[in-house]
Interface confidence: medium
Amino acid sequence: IWELKKDVYVVELDWYPDAPGEMVVLTCDTPEEDGITWTLDQSSEVLGSGKTLTIQVKEFGDAGQYTCHKGGEVLSHSLLLLHKKEDGIWSTDILKDQKEPKNKTFLRCEAKNYSGRFTCWWLTTISTDLTFSVKSSRGSSDPQGVTCGAATLSAERVRGDNKEYEYSVECQEDSACPAAEESLPIEVMVDAVHKLKYENYTSSFFIRDIIKPDPPKNLQLKPLKNSRQVEVSWEYPDTWSTPHSYFSLTFCVQVQGKSKREKKDRVFTDKTSATVICRKNASISVRAQDRYYSSSWSEWASVPCS
Amino acid sequence: RAVPGGSSPAWTQCQQLSQKLCTLAWSAHPLVGHMDLREEGDEETTNDVPHIQCGDGCDPQGLRDNSQFCLQRIHQGLIFYEKLLGSDIFTGEPSLLPDSPVGQLHASLLGLSQLLQPEGHHWETQQIPSLSPSQPWQRLLLRFKILRSLQAFVAVAARVFAHGAATLSP
């Protein structure tokens, strides 16, 4: 058993049929010595008396809010949550496996630049009685500060018969150094509580590996005289790190016909313009990637050829 | 050329070669997303690797103030990786394919380090850890880790030289 926060405790249980469970001793937080009784949740059934209560925790029916009273007055509470371990593996019932970029990916994180700011998100099908708390640091043995906000519900989607809920959180490294080569990864820890079930999820990454620039901005076409060619121009996204002479991007320009089956013409360039042939009903798209480190490409920015 | 006395390097040449290094490092080990190497215990390699840190002066302001700080650190790293790529970690079994980019990568690391420090000048270099994995599978894992780390190092070096070429070239 360990303390998650004030008056909230997590009991770690090996979860299999007829498991013996864990013996837990609760102590009433009071100077009083006698006349103390214990109850669980809203039940008025007295579970025991005295300053301490010893219980055998085996299943969710044994978890909940234990309260000690004296003469009708509440003295203190202890909320017991369960963390299940099945076949040596902690349960992951609350969050959905996103399976990208690999199996058992519950948390996904992205950064728009090297400023030390990043966003993580996760999915669940659970809609109520759900709380999350997020902690983060750079490194684990000598952790350096990362400040995370509160996790918020950021999207709801219908998947078949199920509703899926996306939660996200924004974090900022306290003393970010965008020009440094990271040697210690960022660690993100999410505590998830659904009713009386506790689970924790972790992710470890370097900012450089989760970089995904915003799409290029101000994408414009300029037809060239007496030619089917056009000059495409664009600018670095506002959210990208500066100066651009240091944090450089590379770009992919694509000409795509109306039909997905049509051959795509692609040009790669480090410049912020390119000359391409504009076919009728086609569209021109541009995306960006860090020039020197192969992290994710941005989403496409597009304009029609016409 | 960046000699220890403090003259400027050939920024544009360094920029071109460092960008080539980035391309080679990624072609030598492209499948980064499919293997989380940090799960395999990094202590022996990455702890000894000369990372470019916040206080090494490789940020734009640091380069403007005194590029020698940063150039010396980059030089140290280039020598370190050049020695690792020439060690039995890469020359031993399992043998690299004849057309493997590792050979080119090795030569380019040496080329850039010589651009930064001509013969006869000496900056201190970092001790190379004695890593001699016994099993071929250990060697393979170590190669991946070294290349992964090299990708991060040359990315910072390439940014430095690109910025230098754009803003500090005579």
């Epitope: 500066t242 944090f247 | 206080g55 002066g57």
Partner: antibody, heavy 126, light 106 residues
Framework: EVQLLESGGGLVQPGGSLRLSCAAS????????MMWVRQAPGKGLEWVSY????????VYADSVKGRFTISRDNSKNTLYLQMNSLRAEDTAMYYC???????????????????WGQGTMVTVSS | QSALTQPPSVSVSPGQTASITCSGR??????ASWYQQKPGQSPVLVIY???KRPSGIPERFSGSKSGNTATLTIRETQPMDEADYYC?????????FGGGTKLTVL
């Protein structure tokens, strides 16, 4: 708690040597540039030398060049200043300071000395 | 090594605003920092990057820069603000400090 603690000062004759130490605690020492600053009695601050986080690069004020050597041992979280050929004008309180790099969205990251030690007094006199 | 010039002393009545200037050739191209040093104590960073305040420094302290002159302003000056104040800038790879200004709260 983030702290710098200097030691090694004292009375020394002209031409003599001293080695100052600065023990760092409460932060990841190996990530920061460090520097020595001195202050003669009743006078202003004068920078002496600074060193990169890895220890590979150093810069000195003209007044101490060739006589003083700055170094660091990241495994011991300690900064050093070896002072040789000491002169009367080197008499001062010697402070070590951490050089913090502040990230600025313009991309130009200013430095400042955000943590200072309590200082150690060096007196050069016959 | 370019010098930074500060007035040797500035006097102010409690509750009033004190301003200390620092001027130097090409200071406009550089960032200025300001340090406070009380008698018998180590310097403390009060302003960096011309106008940024580190955490723990009261809001009464502010910095600004116009051309080649940086200014440290202390609003509602208190007796505890009595100290020497130094401006500082980086000049290429060397560091420059101003001569210091003694602030007296009358």
């Amino acid at each position: 708690e983030v702290q710098l603690l200097e030691s090694g000062g004292g009375l020394v004759q002209p031409g003599g040597s001293l080695r100052l130490s600065c023990a760092a605690s409460g932060f990841t020492f190996s990530r920061y540039m460090m520097m020595w600053v001195r202050q003669a009695p009743g006078k202003g601050l004068e920078w002496v030398s600074y060193i990169s986080s890895s220890g590979g690069s150093t810069v000195y004020a003209d007044s101490v060049k060739g006589r003083f050597t700055i170094s660091r041992d990241n495994s011991k979280n300690t900064l050093y200043l070896q002072m040789n050929s000491l002169r009367a004008e080197d008499t001062a309180m010697y402070y070590c300071a951490r050089i913090r790099l502040y990230y600025d969205s313009s991309g130009y990251w200013p430095r400042a000395f955000d943590i200072w030690g309590q200082g150690t007094m060096v007196t050069v006199s016959s | 090594q370019s010098a930074l010039t500060q007035p040797p002393s500035v006097s102010v009545s409690p509750g009033q605003t004190a301003s200390i200037t620092c001027s130097g050739r090409k200071l406009g191209d550089k960032y200025a920092s300001w340090y406070q040093q009380k008698p018998g104590q180590s310097p403390v960073l009060v302003i960096y990057q011309d106008d940024k305040r580190p955490s723990g420094i009261p809001e009464r302290f502010s910095g600004s820069k116009s051309g080649n002159t940086a200014t440290l302003t202390i609003r509602e000056t208190q007796p505890m603000d009595e100290a020497d104040y130094y401006c500082q800038a980086w000049a290429s790879s060397s560091v420059t400090f101003g001569g210091g200004t003694k602030l007296t709260v009358l």
